[in-house]
């Protein structure tokens, strides 16, 4: 079959997900698409613990997570409800600002310096995480 | 020997289709996003299309979305590349080629030795 | 989509003689750009990747600089079969790859 047991070389593996974390920035459609030719998504963080699992690998740096808005309502982009789900935003965010220059507002989520959540321009090259479910990711992916 | 082999170019009128194959040896096809690049005569190199290790995303060129499926048989380590509705355009010696990621960046590092698609009347 | 230029467009040149590539992108790409060789009727290869990591079993007489904009590829002793043309590739846009459009290695 094609379900693993362990994780890629170079992914990390947490509560039966396999992680990768990026050390260089991308624009998040971008990252969204990096993840996906993996076999994977940006990361969708579930739970606290997750969350802290996520903050301690990335460190104070702003990282893409797969959370956005650009169709309207927050998505993950996984399908996991947004509204019952796991947040993590710093105070009076997320708030859509427009008032950075770029045109338009702020669509797509990240992990500030302090791990709690931001909106911001989806253009930004922001570092990402990107993660699969552990009994689908397929045989020996490539190093990473 | 890692290798990739093209076949199934050929002469093609214009609205006509075509089935390009890629048939992997030498590596883990299965472990690699595979891409279709094409290079028109005399011309330079152009991205058509590339698929996820498992087949499941695919994107596309604007010049070529619609007409091209790209789709891959892991179990056959075999790449392919459907073009219908082809064009003077799409003239072109076609490529495969593995993508190589590391550490974030990515290119292509395997390429097979081109297949020549000719659309005329 | 992203713009690659490359400069020259065709450069003659002798064996010995350190040669030296020019890419240049739209926008900023960081160091999201890669080099190929390409011979007369033969498929690229992969030279150089992430602007300066050399590709495995490629000679160290290649190197390559740069980052956000501007990158070079340079040929510090140009050897008879570097005669070719090499192309310049961005990969910040994933996956819309796109090339530059080359830059022809001749004898002089």
């Known amino acids: 079959g094609s379900e693993r047991t362990c994780c890629p070389v170079n992914w990390v593996e947490h509560e039966r997900s396999c992680y990768w974390f990026s050390r260089s920035g991308k624009a998040w459609a971008d990252a969204d698409n990096y993840c996906r030719l993996e076999d994977a998504h940006l990361v969708v963080v579930t739970s606290w613990e997750e969350q802290k699992f996520v903050q301690h690998h990335i460190g104070p740096v702003n990282t893409w997570m797969g959370l956005h808005d650009q169709n309207g309502p927050w998505k993950w982009v996984d399908g996991t409800d947004y509204e019952t789900g796991f947040k993590n935003w710093r105070p009076e965010q997320p708030d859509d600002w427009y008032g950075h220059g770029l045109g338009g507002g702020e669509d797509c989520a990240h992990f500030t310096d302090d791990g709690r959540w931001n909106d911001d321009v989806c253009q930004r090259p922001y570092r990402w995480v990107c993660e699969t479910e552990l009994d689908k990711a397929s045989q020996e992916p490539p190093l990473l | 020997e890692v290798q990739l082999l093209e076949s199934g170019g050929g002469l093609v009128q214009p609205g006509g289709s075509l089935r390009l194959s890629c048939a992997a040896s030498?590596?883990?096809?299965?472990?690699?996003?595979m891409n279709w690049v094409r290079q028109a005569p005399g011309m330079g190199l152009e991205w058509v299309s590339v698929i996820s290790r498992s087949g499941g995303y695919t994107y596309y060129a604007d010049s070529v979305k619609g007409r091209f499926t790209i789709s891959r048989d892991n179990s056959k380590n075999t790449l392919y590349l459907q073009m219908n509705s082809l064009r003077a355009e799409d003239t072109a010696v076609y490529y495969c080629a593995s993508r190589l990621a590391v550490a974030g960046s990515e290119a292509f590092d395997i390429w097979g030795q081109g297949t020549l698609v000719t659309v005329s009347s | 989509d992203i713009q690659m230029t490359q400069s020259p467009s065709s450069l003659s040149a002798s064996v010995g003689d350190r040669v030296t590539i020019t890419c240049r992108a739209s926008?900023?790409?960081?160091?999201?750009l890669n080099w190929y060789q390409q011979k007369q009727g033969k498929a690229p290869k992969l030279l150089i990747y992430a602007a300066s990591s050399l590709q495995n079993g490629v000679p160290s007489r290649f190197s390559g600089r740069g980052s956000g904009t501007d990158f070079t590829l340079t040929i510090s002793s140009l050897q008879p079969e570097d005669f070719a043309t090499y192309y310049c590739q961005q990969s910040y846009r994933t996956p819309l790859f796109t090339f530059g459009p080359g830059t022809k290695v001749d004898f002089k």
């Open positions: 926008q900023n790409i960081s160091s999201y």
């Open positions: 030498g590596f883990t096809f299965s472990s690699y996003a």
